[in-house]
Interface confidence: medium
């Protein structure tokens, strides 16, 4: 229904927190370089605006709609050309395309320093003099740092940061209760993060219907007692929010989402019998529970899948009267037979299934062409599988950080060019795959390996669209969402690729390594790793092995001497020419 | 029991509308996705439209989009098909369904109500 005034509609719909909470992760996105105190100070003022839209519709200015007030806010910010350069020039355009100006320039890898936890004590200080400010913070950090963070799920993140301070700052050892909760709660929202990337990136460039399809496989496996016409209705009402969401439109976009939680739990009858729990739940916890409710269970007296899709005569007929739907059939049925299947897999099935029927259906004797199409499946189920052997196998034995380094060598023969600093963080990721997936039940394991793998590699063909260097990726990130991971798999190492000379200054360690954490150590490491395959991109693992061990020795050999500066510079020169050596 | 009852059918000439209605009863209407499938004579069963149980979305075969409308009133119980537009390869015997989980199977239906398309 149309209301007069837009902005007062969202302020009474999601309640003052939440609508001051969705317009700071806006500003946020939109200009990721300016200060907290900046955006807090905007946030205000589209605050009091649409209060007093809510006490007057008809006031000056209330009817605009959010993308128009959202804009203005934005291009009256001082000195937007000096800090955002050409995003500046979005300004001199007409809604809607200075909100689709202002989308093009989310930056995905914006250089801001990493996101650094203060100490817990200083941590509850600020969280107790001021918990609206604190929070404001880590919404305000985390949206900037991650543009298309889905933003009702950041909410639920900042409350569930809310929740654990306030239950550790009352301990007597806040650091010990703090740092395992928070560490966790950090891994989930950047999961989240990947995941929404790609929803998006989905949407971007492949449109509304390529994302409807994603969502008609993942609900028909979670509710597979659900019938089509719920699926669907499902899959539109969600295609809508995350169109919402990715498009920018966070207000309304939370607001839908609210929407259909209430939906599903007013219809739990006609969609899963497992979604009471998470509909007992407040909002937002609601909304995070039902996105990850565990799968129904699968109706005992399922067809086979080929009396409609192969055995029957109807089968062209029904494809050519509604091409769509039937698929849209197709895509459902075989999806609640396969909750052990991946999304993307479930996808390439059904756009296997549709190039036979295209091919088969013009053919004189059609059943007899796509009689087959189900045994021509199978090597498209056998390939994930095999994926997931390997490499649950490779994790098993080597563990994560080792499992993160085989990664990385696998990524910088398949593509040299790409910087390493990006080689790192995506082998890092994918090689968490290990400890995310492959500890799981065996039916559980290929969907877990498969579609993160997939969110990942969408960050890295995104981080490769900035600065294009590798022909491999290129051709890998340019063909449809769902071939790229196994595109990416079956790159083998890149012959046209000129090796990189050996410069020892790479190589060279002083002693302020030895007083980085863990995780910093380990990037030094890989960083090193990585530079070593550029120079010899034939390496044997062998050969790595010895020189990895060799700098894990000298690491630890300097880091333990009495005087480190002399350790590092006198045995630093001994290990560059070791690893020559092994390596000529 | 489940009783569908078709109704509103008749003769009409190309390019006439007709409304048919089908009165559901035995079953919660209001949780269920319905249907409406036509067979001419001598032909298979096709189906024509869908709608989900809240009104939306609906969905229509290619032959009949944007000439025919589904649409429910679940306080009534009952389920309308508008038909505008109509041509010769319309006439068919019309049934309404309650929508199965297996694309073709329908699990109840009623008579059928005819539909003459004819100058």
């Known amino acids: 229904e149309a209301h007069k005034s837009e902005i007062a509609h969202r302020y009474n719909d999601l309640g003052e927190q939440h609508f001051k909470g969705l317009v700071l992760i806006a500003f946020s996105q939109y200009l990721q370089k300016c200060s907290y105190d900046e955006h807090a100070k905007l946030v205000q003022e589209v605050t009091d605006f649409a209060k007093t839209c809510v006490a007057d519709e008809s006031a000056a200015n209330c009817d605009k709609s959010l993308h128009t007030l959202f804009g203005d806010k934005l291009c009256a910010i001082p000195n937007l050309r000096e800090n955002y350069g050409e995003l500046a020039d979005c300004c001199t355009k007409q809604e809607p395309e200075r909100n689709e100006c202002f989308l093009q320039h989310k930056d995905d890898n914006p250089s801001l320093p990493p996101f650094e936890r203060p100490e817990a004590e200083a941590m509850c200080t600020s969280f107790k003099e001021n918990p609206t400010t604190f929070m404001g913070h880590y919404l305000h950090e985390v949206a900037r740092r991650h543009p298309y963070f889905y933003a009702p799920e950041l909410l639920y993140y900042a409350e569930q940061y809310n929740e654990i301070l306030t239950q550790c700052c009352a301990e007597a050892d806040k650091e010990s209760c703090l740092t395992p909760k928070l560490d966790g709660v950090k891994e989930k929202a950047l999961v989240s993060s990947v995941r929404q990337r790609m929803k998006c990136s989905s949407m971007q460039k492949f449109g509304e219907r390529a994302f409807k399809a994603w969502a008609v496989a993942r609900l028909s496996q979670t509710f597979p007692n659900a019938d089509f016409a719920e699926i669907t209705k499902l899959a539109t009402d969600l295609t809508k929010v995350n169109k919402e969401c990715c498009h920018g439109d966070l207000l309304e976009c939370a607001d839908d989402r609210a929407e259909l939680a209430k939906y599903m739990c007013e219809n739990q009858a006609t969609i899963s019998s497992k979604l009471q729990t998470c509909c007992d739940k407040p909002l937002l916890k609601k909304a995070h529970c039902l996105s990850e409710v565990e799968h129904d269970t699968m109706p005992a007296d399922l067809p086979a899948i080929a009396a409609d899709f192969v055995e029957d005569q109807e089968v062209c007929k029904n494809y050519a009267e509604a091409k769509d739907v039937f698929l849209g059939t197709f895509l459902y049925e075989y999806s609640r037979r396969h909750p052990d299947y991946s999304v993307s897999l479930l996808l390439r099935l059904a756009k296997k299934y549709e190039a036979t029927l295209e091919k088969c259906c013009a053919e004189a004797n059609p059943p007899a062409c796509y009689g087959t199409v189900l045994a021509e499946f199978q090597p498209l189920v056998e390939e994930p599988k095999n994926l997931v052997k390997t490499n649950c196998d490779l994790y098993e034995k080597l563990g994560e950080y080792g499992f993160q380094n085989a990664i990385l060598v696998r990524y910088t023969q398949k593509a040299p060019q790409v910087s390493t600093p990006t080689l790192v963080e995506a082998a890092r990721n994918l090689g968490r795959v290990g400890t995310k997936c492959c500890t799981l039940p065996e039916d559980q394991r290929l969907p877990c390996v498969e579609d993160y793998l997939s969110a990942i590699l969408n960050r890295v063909c995104l981080l490769h669209e900035k600065t294009p260097v590798s022909e491999h990726v290129t051709k890998c990130c340019s063909g449809s969402l769902v071939e790229r991971r196994p595109c990416f798999s079956a790159l083998t190492v890149d012959e046209t690729y000129v090796p990189k000379e050996f410069k020892a200054e790479t190589f060279t360690f002083h002693s302020d390594i030895c007083t980085l954490p863990e995780k910093e150590k380990q990037i030094k490491k890989q960083t090193a790793l990585a530079e070593l395959v550029k120079h010899k991109p034939k390496a044997t693992a062998e050969q790595l092995k010895t020189v990895m061990d060799d700098f894990a020795q000298f690491l630890d050999t300097c880091c333990k001497a009495a005087d480190k500066d002399t350790c590092f510079s006198t045995e630093g020169p001994n290990l560059v020419t070791r690893c020559k050596d092994a390596l000529a | 029991e489940v009783q569908l009852l078709e109704s509103g059918g008749g003769l009409v000439q190309p390019g006439g509308s007709l409304r048919l209605s089908c009165a559901a009863s035995?079953?919660?209407?209001?949780?269920?996705?319905m249907l409406w499938v036509r067979q001419a004579p001598g032909k298979g069963l096709e189906w024509v439209s869908v709608i989900h149980q809240s009104g939306t979305p609906t969905y229509y075969a290619d032959s009949v989009k944007g000439r025919f409308t589904i649409s429910r009133d679940n306080s009534k119980n009952t389920l309308y098909l508008q038909m505008n537009s109509l041509r010769a390869e319309d006439t068919a015997v019309y049934y309404c369904a309650k929508f199965p989980s297996t694309h073709g199977k329908f699990d109840y239906w009623g008579q059928g109500t005819l539909v003459t398309v004819s100058s």
């Open positions: 035995g079953f919660t209407f209001d949780t269920s996705s």
